[in-house]
């Protein structure tokens, strides 16, 4: 039975040209996290595998940085980065948990960042 829940940074906004941290946290389960996939719509951005380390998709390597923790940092944001992002947690023995974040990249300098948290 899957008892865990994913907490995310929710809906966030950031300025064009800036950077943002995408962060998810799995709680309320003792399941072991074996891998976290980060996807934008159906496009893979990165994988963090417990055994193998990080894999960053080559097409994003110049704008995506691993971390902090299991999170992902997006840099040099453009308006085209606006959209849904998903963190997909593969766990054992529970299975798969998915979290959703909506990022809006704004032209103006008054973008307010959503609340962020750090994984302890």
């Amino acid at each position: 039975m899957m008892t865990g829940t994913i907490e995310t940074t929710g809906n966030i906004s950031a300025e064009k040209g800036g950077s943002i941290i995408l962060q998810c946290h799995l709680s309320s389960t003792t399941a072991q996290v074996t891998q976290v996939n980060w996807e934008q719509q159906d496009q893979l951005l990165a994988i963090c595998n417990a055994d193998l380390g990080w894999h960053i998709s080559p097409s994003f390597k110049d704008r995506v940085a691993p971390g902090p923790g299991l999170g992902l940092t997006l840099q040099s944001l453009t308006v085209n980065d606006t959209g849904e992002y998903f963190c997909i947690y593969h766990t054992y023995p529970d299975g798969t948990y998915t979290g959703r974040i909506f990022l809006e990249v704004l032209e103006s300098s008054v973008a307010e960042h959503g609340a962020r948290f750090q994984i302890p």
């Epitope: 074996t34 891998q35 893979l44 994988i47 595998n49 055994d51 193998l52 380390g53 894999h55 998709s57 080559p58 097409s59 390597k61 593969h90 054992y92 299975g95 798969t96």
Partner: antibody, heavy 119, light 107 residues
Framework: EVQLVQSGAEVKKPGASVKVSCKAS????????MHWVRQAPGQGLEWMGR????????KYNEKFKTRVTMTRDTSTSTVYMELSSLRSEDTAVYYC????????????WGQGTLVTVSS | DIQMTQSPSSLSASVGDRVTITCRAS??????LAWYQQKPGKAPKLLIY???TLAEGVPSRFSGSGSGTDFTLTISSLQPEDFATYYC?????????FGGGTKVEIK
Amino acid sequence: EVQLVQSGAEVKKPGASVKVSCKASGYTFTNYWMHWVRQAPGQGLEWMGRIDPDSTGSKYNEKFKTRVTMTRDTSTSTVYMELSSLRSEDTAVYYCAREGAYGYYFDYWGQGTLVTVSS
Amino acid sequence: DIQMTQSPSSLSASVGDRVTITCRASENIYSYLAWYQQKPGKAPKLLIYNARTLAEGVPSRFSGSGSGTDFTLTISSLQPEDFATYYCQYHSGSPLPFGGGTKVEIK
């Protein structure tokens, strides 16, 4: 065209070390991790480890952790795999292989380097 | 560590035959499975990744299916150049294990 060209065959004595090179071309070298996989004569494939040409970060198969070192030279787009304390069971063809764009599989392979360990 | 088991270890078939090779994982690996083809004296060649995605330049007669623990590589109509050894690989966990291989021979 992506190409991975490996160094030539080696014959080594037990206890010695061997260093195999793999020169990459046809793509941005620092964008893709490189792996090493070996194949003993008539046997299957065995993963040894991976190295990030961008940062030199590496991950090794526990089986080889104490004996293998993977390095890179970005100026020549070359990765190296050094295996120490060789024994006869290390006789194999050693392949470098580029990590795929969507995960830890291998989309391009070098031609292989035969390492023979014999007294 | 997860173990990958291929079957059969060898098979004989004729040009034009439909060939199916299976790969079983010792536990759930989702869809993180790749298939490779290797000819004698040559390096392996990627055919399929993520269980069903055809690699660039691979003919459409090759297809992959399955998820979880059971996977299949199908060659819809065997061609002379397809006689080779085929390996499956779990591509999301150390030590990135391969199956033992399936040798496809001419009948």
